[in-house]
Amino acid sequence: KAMHVAQPAVVLANSRGIASFVCEYASPGKATEVRVTVLRQADSQVTEVCAATYMMGNELTFLDDSICTGTSSGNQVNLTIQGLRAMDTGLYICKVELMYPPPYYMGIGNGTQIYVIDPEPCPDSD
Amino acid sequence: KAMHVAQPAVVLANSRGIASFVCEYASPGKATEVRVTVLRQADSQVTEVCAATYMMGNELTFLDDSICTGTSSGNQVNLTIQGLRAMDTGLYICKVELMYPPPYYMGIGNGTQIYVIDPEPCPDSD
């Protein structure tokens, strides 16, 4: 079953390569277990950036080596992606699945264009 | 008389606060004197950033204290805006006027969204 997912059109990564955005879903049912997946689309290729399954109201638990962190609040997920470089500029799509209890719902946002600018290196301190 | 002006939708300023983009116009006539104006639109307010009048094939001459520099090549103007800070993020509109000889033509682009990220300060070198 389809579900509406909203996310901002554009976000700028800060100079430390960190970008944050909110992914909001219009929950048609009362889900307890939710899965959020961040996909990156670049040059018509889609790759999975990170994913987390969480219980409503809890922190999102990503794998230890993930570049993502997040928190949930109601039907909003606050996602932060770190370690971004200029080459990571692209469209980051938020996919939300209401996993359990049934019925299963899935929604995909239109994507957030994340722009990343590599910082200038600091001068050597001699 | 109206004239089509094309410019990129999005440009990122680099970490030194410099953003460059090309403003291209479809010249209906053979102009020798051209005027280029960069306008910034933010919060529904439009302000002039810089302007230069140039003879076709010549350098663009902006005022000494201008934050803009540029070169021209045929119907293309390569604009560079420097000294940008995060607060300068906004829509930069290219306006081109074919001043001489008559007839006068004027065209306005759809604007280039320039994103600016302030760099992290470098650590003190003690």
Epitope: T32, E33, M55, N58, M99, Y100, P101, Y104 | -
Partner: antibody, heavy 120, light 107 residues
Framework: EVQLVESGGGLVQPGGSLRLACAAS????????MDWVRQVPGKGLEWVGR??????????EYVASVKGRFTISREDSKNSVYLQMNSLKTEDTAVYYC???????????WGQGTTVTVSS | DIQMTQSPSSLSASVGDRVTITCRAS??????LAWFQQKPGNAPKSLIY???SLQSGVPSKFSGSGSGTDFTLTISSLQPEDFATYYC?????????FGQGTRLEIK
């Protein structure tokens, strides 16, 4: 009546394999998550893993101590969930229960358990 | 992993007594906590879910409370059939984990 019945337990040598089965009846099996929980004789309960439903592509979760050795699968057409146990260790000796995860996430229905003994 | 610590580990009480068992999580688990009763030779039986919701068919003498990290199971008036081992379980985060159990014995 809602019921779960485990089978397939027995004696196996360390390094060996065993496949446990859990047959469900009395409810729409395909709509539920199914879990395996084990209990070393005289000790406490340890969650082994979970199989999600078809809508969630039968994805699974495991406790770290069995990850890579145990695999949970299910056959909705047979109302059954399975626990394939490979590279068994003596510390896997336990009574293995299957349980249904209700929509409120309680493990509300349990089987009677099947005993697995890993010994040389 | 989230550690669940029950106290006491064992408890002696008399028929008619009111007893309380506590369970502490090593981190915030919201209200994603369940309580089970297990008698020797039997499978565990679900008593409480979501910290305080009574499982269908479970008598109201059982009650649960708490949120975050500290939880309690209370049995208001002990009957002979209540002497068993009780386990708490968190289902906030994978892997799901149980407490070590509290053995309730007749005094």
């Amino acid at each position: 009546e809602v019921q779960l019945v485990e089978s397939g337990g027995g004696l196996v040598q360390p390094g060996g394999s065993l496949r446990l089965a859990c047959a469900a009846s009395g409810f729409t099996f395909s709509d539920y998550y199914m879990d395996w929980v084990r209990q070393v004789p005289g000790k406490g309960l340890e969650w082994v893993g979970r199989s999600r439903d078809k809508a969630n592509s039968f994805t699974t979760e495991y406790v770290a101590s069995v990850k890579g050795r145990f695999t949970i699968s299910r056959e909705d057409s047979k109302n059954s969930v399975y626990l394939q146990m490979n590279s068994l260790k003596t510390e896997d000796t336990a009574v293995y229960y299957c349980a249904r995860t209700n929509y409120d996430f309680s493990l509300d229905v349990w089987g009677q358990g099947t005993t697995v003994t890993v010994s040389s | 992993d989230i550690q669940m610590t029950q106290s006491p580990s064992s408890l002696s009480a008399s028929v008619g007594d009111r007893v309380t068992i506590t369970c502490r999580a090593s981190q915030d688990i919201n209200n994603y906590l369940a309580w089970f009763q297990q008698k020797p030779g039997n499978a565990p039986k679900s008593l409480i879910y979501a910290a305080s919701s009574l499982q269908s068919g479970v008598p109201s003498k059982f009650s649960g409370s708490g949120s975050g990290t500290d939880f309690t199971l209370t049995i208001s008036s002990l009957q002979p059939e209540d002497f068993a081992t009780y386990y708490c379980q968190q289902y906030s985060t994978y892997p799901i984990t149980f407490g070590q159990g509290t053995r309730l014995e007749i005094k």
